[in-house]
Amino acid sequence: GWVWNQFFVPEEMNTTSHHIGQLRSDLDNGNNSFQYKLLGAGAGSTFIIDERTGDIYAIQKLDREERSLYILRAQVIDIATGRAVEPESEFVIKVSDINDNEPKFLDEPYEAIVPEMSPEGTLVIQVTASDADDPSSGNNARLLYSLLQGQPYFSVEPTTGVIRISSKMDRELQDEYWVIIQAKDMIGQPGALSGTTSVLIKLSDVNDNKPIFKESFYRFTISESAPIGTSIGKIMAYDDDIGENAEMEYSIEDDDSKIFDIIIDNDTQEGIVILKKKVDFEQQSYYGIRAKVKNCHVDEELAPAHVNASTTYIKVQVEDEDEPPVFLLPYYILEIPEGKPYGTIVGTVSATDPDRRQSPMRYYLTGSKMFDINDNGTIITTNMLDREVSAWYNLTVTATETYNVQQISSAHVYVQVFNINDNAPEFSQFYETYVCENAESGEIVQIISAIDRDESIEDHHFYFNHSLEDTNNSSFMLTDNQDNTAVILSNRTGFNLKEEPVFYMIILIADNGIPSLTSTNTLTIQVCDCGDSRNTETCANKGLLFIMGFRTE
């Protein structure tokens, strides 16, 4: 049978050939009659057999990491007969490991983020090195990790490569650290190979800093004429944190008058002091307010770092402006009865200079020539007023400072003209009245109504009467309907166009004013040949129209 021991060949041998062992048949008595042969992958190129002795040699440098074993076949032949002495047999040559590979960090680059101020022992990252050597061959691939750079802030677990924090770090002092980790094989024994890797450890921000005002005192000025919403000035607080942890909000602590407010400029994180109410130099020339700043987002566990919020004092100086005059009232409503003589005082308006110098005023009036104003602000009539012409006057009074005529203010003055009963009622229209020749007694000839140009506090009430003076006109009669209308009735049967073509009826209309006014009105009644229809609608076309005027007494 075959005789051999396990074959091993060390990798990376530099010799031209290396004796591995001997293959032989136990039938080989050394009579020089056997020939040994090697077959299979690597035979003749990597491995050579001395065909006389069965000695096997490696003639190439081998790399276990490339190939760790070779399976070959052995033959032994009797030279004399050419026949196999033993059955062909498979055998294995194992390439034994030497420590020829250094540990390598395959997952580079390493980068980790850990919150600042993390406590000792906090896990940062695990780095892992790989060693291509045989893990089952001694300590060739057994690794130990150590820290070459990064003390005293970091430590590494020797067997796991876990990096932990060993000292608290403040991002505001240094925000990133380069840690160098070394991995050594042979568990660090002499002859060990090593590899290193760099780990970039970035500290993420925690809100461990409160915002602090850059200045403890700010001085701003604002014109008293500044409108609401005006930016008065900017205040600035600094927070060493970043991002959301540096977001801040400003507030005003001492401002009982609620005149100021602070809004934030999100781009610059500045506080903008704005005007919430108008200021008046003459009322208050400066304001002292205190502003406070705090972070928008504070975790409970970091609250102790945020007690005693930073404050700053802001002095706002109000600048005096030459202000225009100010009327006592925003507008005026004055009343005057109609019919008063010119020069009658309607009322008085008053404007004053809000500034300390108290300039005298000069007044101007526009909107109607019926009024004038003097330097005291007294408005008088320049004409007699007739309510029936205009019941209201819309005037504009302009006040100007005599010291500075550019400073002008205006106020509206509304003058209401009161009614007095100075107008008698009269026919509401011109009546074209016709009566048919064949009219019967009691037949309605005309319904009349009146108007009164006066204003009535209550409703107007008109009284209609046939004038007693109109004695020659008994052909018609008047009936007051008590509803501000009256009806004219035929008082006879039949009229003669040729003999009496026209009748003039004098009608008195009185109002209910105090005192009452009465007007005399003449109603012209024309006789018309209506035919059988007794319809006066065609009468106007017959050229019988007599245009008569009104007469009012």
């Epitope: 020089n32 001395d50 004399a80």
Partner: antibody, heavy 122, light 108 residues
């Protein structure tokens, strides 16, 4: 064609080590067996031993304890070391190549060097 | 070890004659692995015959070998002047390789 050339000191003191080198030119040392043979003055030939190019050796039992044959394929050379020499080791030393007339076992020597004379004397 | 005995020790012949050299082994030579060499003064041996009967490259056909087992013969059919030299037989069928003591072929 392949030629062999022996080299080494011609005089060696008794008890010292005789060292010779055979340089192969005109061909490769690979795939052949290479022998050392000596011939004392006026006497016949004695085979000392061979080396296979991979380093496998076989020595004459009569000299085995004192002989070392080695090969350096990079230089195309093989060497002989004979330790503890005496006057009986004075001889003409030849290097020779076994032919490949047949596949397998030992073969005849088809190429010889011209020989180098080594005298052992104090 | 296999001991090879060559005879005669010296053989005196004239050119043109036939020479027969003998080599006897102390035990059978496996595979007829026997060779013949020619050595002239001041020269290295030269291979003539291998495998008992095969002529080496460039050897004239007047040289022939025969035999098996323990008895082997080298024959030179017609001696040429350059053939006068010392002839050695060698067995390489079993380690160690051994040579005969040699036969001197001299011109008569």
């Amino acid at each position: 064609q392949v030629q062999l050339q022996e080299s080494g000191p011609g005089l060696v003191k008794p008890s010292e080590t005789l060292s010779l080198t055979c340089t192969v030119s005109g061909g490769s040392i690979n795939s052949y067996y290479w022998s050392w043979i000596r011939q004392p003055p006026g006497k016949g030939l004695e085979w000392i031993g061979y080396i296979y190019y991979i380093g496998s050796t076989n020595y004459n039992p009569s000299l085995k304890s004192r002989v070392t044959i080695s090969v350096d394929t990079s230089k195309n050379q093989f060497s002989l070391k004979l330790s503890s020499v005496t006057a009986a080791d004075t001889a003409l030393y030849y290097c020779a190549r076994e032919s490949r007339y047949r596949s397998g076992w030992y073969d005849a020597f088809d190429i010889w060097g011209q020989g180098t004379m080594v005298t052992v004397s104090s | 070890d296999i001991v090879l005995t060559q005879s005669p020790g010296t053989l005196s012949l004239s050119p043109g004659e036939r020479a027969t050299l003998s080599c006897r082994a102390s035990q059978s030579v496996a595979g007829s692995y026997l060779a013949w060499y020619q050595q002239k003064p001041g020269q290295a041996p030269r291979l003539l015959i291998y495998g008992a009967s095969s002529r080496a490259t460039g050897i004239p056909d007047r040289f022939s070998g025969s035999g098996s087992g323990t008895d082997f013969t080298l024959t030179i059919s017609r001696l040429e002047p350059e053939d006068f030299a010392v002839y050695y037989c060698q067995q390489y069928g079993k380690s160690p390789i051994t040579f005969g003591q040699g036969t001197r072929l001299e011109m008569k």
